[in-house]
């Protein structure tokens, strides 16, 4: 997260880190005791999932292996539409005050809505500085019409933009797949943005979760 702040401890109990070995690969969101939602571009053969701690690499955090992941069937490596994936944990998480599932959206929030995005991604760009603490940034949803002024045809129908006018605050390497939460519901998953990160008036682009609720529920049910 560029130009963010340290998240209030324990305020993001649904936030997970997808690790490759001990190294941060992507963020993710706990949606069920067996399931983590993340971006399709975060796919790996297997994952080490850290839950229940704001510190990356925390020895006291829950760490669960995941060997199965399910990309949205419409994910395109060319256009990056449908950049969403479910990761099935090999064993259920132990829910607690530090580990909770996020609330999936009942509706799509409108432009102007205040949201928070979080992650352990780099805080500087293009040179990288990875924080140990979970970082947050407060952003507002931007209309597709406004966002298309920047990204033109790169912006798909199920992509969501968020940012703050004239501000550098944004997501960056390592934040991918992490949550954009608005009014206590998951509205977005970090997908992409311009690079170097933090260029004012280049919004962060997210997968719009409200448009995938049926796919999420059906996929979890199919692979119970």
């Amino acid at each position: 997260i560029i130009d963010g702040y340290k998240c209030k401890e324990g305020s993001h109990p649904w936030q997970v880190a997808l690790l490759k070995g001990n190294q941060l690969h992507c963020g993710g969101v706990l949606v069920d005791k067996y399931w983590v939602l993340t971006a399709a571009h975060c796919k790996m053969g297997q994952y080490q999932v850290q839950l229940g701690s704001d510190k990356i690499g925390d020895q006291s955090a829950q760490k669960i292996k995941a060997t199965k992941s399910f990309r949205h069937p419409g994910y395109s490596t060319k256009t990056h539409v449908n950049d969403i994936m479910l990761v099935r944990l090999d064993e259920p998480v132990k829910m607690s005050s530090k580990v909770e599932a996020v609330q999936l959206p009942e509706h799509c929030e409108p432009p102007g809505t205040s949201c928070t995005v979080s992650g352990w991604g780099t805080t500087t760009s293009p040179d990288v500085t990875f924080p140990s603490d979970l970082m947050c940034s407060d952003v507002k949803l931007i209309s597709s019409r406004e966002c298309k002024k920047v990204y033109k045809d790169l912006l798909g129908k199920t992509m969501l933009c968020a940012g703050i006018p004239d501000s550098k605050t944004n997501t960056c390497n390592g934040d991918s797949g992490g949550p954009l939460v608005c009014n206590d519901t998951l509205q977005g998953l970090v997908s992409w943005g311009t690079y170097p990160c933090g260029q004012p008036n280049d919004p962060g682009v997210y997968t719009q979760v409200c448009k995938y609720k049926r796919w999420v529920m059906e996929t979890m049910k199919t692979h119970r």
Partner: antibody
């Protein structure tokens, strides 16, 4: 230091295959994509394709589809490009390059290998 | 696929000259265009990304401009080490990434 180091020059006969390697160091290999670009003698640059080091997702240039395979070995931070059924017009310098960006999209090549000369001759 | 057309294909200039190279896209690519410099026997090197942003470590005599379909690379005062071939590429509609044909800058 941050670099991509490629394997040495190759001389191949028409119809043979070649496999070029590209070893990354100084950065997290799995966080970036590796692309392959070639340059025939005295000619311009031609994009061949790309691979995501973490997911293994590939995109190949249409004209090379079916003849090219890109792979990675994350344990050694190495990318490979294999080209089969070689023809004389495949004679070129082959470069690997790192794509800069984050998340699903990347925007430019910020790091290049030194190049590998592949000569196809009978 | 988007075609990138560079002009001129070659030019002769003297040290201290102002040099301008253009790149035209077959359709709008917004500002997702980059410029690279390549010297004989060497790999290309990034100069400008996003049409106008100078890559770290590149001298400020290099500048880029343009948006949509027409782009320009300018060298404000040509130095001896600038004699090389210059390429543009587009990352708007990818894959494929497409390159311009190159512009060779030679000593007059």
């Amino acid at each position: 230091q941050v670099q991509l180091v490629q394997s040495g020059a190759e001389v191949k006969k028409p119809g043979a295959s070649v496999k070029v390697s590209c070893k990354a160091s100084g950065y997290t290999f799995t966080s970036e994509g590796i692309h392959w670009v070639r340059q025939a003698p005295g000619q311009g640059l031609e994009w061949m394709g790309s691979i995501s080091a973490s997911s293994g997702d590939t995109n190949y240039a249409q004209k090379l589809q079916g003849r090219v395979t890109m792979t990675t070995d994350t344990s050694t931070s190495t990318a490979y490009m294999e080209l089969r059924s070689l023809r004389s017009d495949d004679t070129a310098v082959y470069y690997c390059a790192r794509a800069a960006g984050y998340g699903a999209r990347h925007w430019y090549f910020d790091l290049w290998g030194q190049g590998t000369m592949v000569t196809v001759s009978s | 696929d988007i075609q990138m057309t560079q002009s001129p294909s070659s030019l002769s200039a003297s040290v201290g000259d102002r040099v301008t190279i253009t790149c035209r896209a077959s359709q709008s690519i917004s500002s997702y265009l980059n410029w690279y410099q390549q010297k004989p026997g060497k790999a290309p090197k990034l100069l400008i990304y996003g049409a106008s942003s100078l890559q770290s470590g590149v001298p400020s005599r290099f500048s880029g401009s343009g948006s949509g379909t027409d782009f320009t690379l300018t060298i404000s005062s040509l130095q001896p080490e600038d004699f090389a071939t210059y390429y543009c590429d587009q990352w708007y509609s990818t894959p494929p990434i497409t390159f311009g044909g190159g512009t060779k800058v030679e000593i007059k």
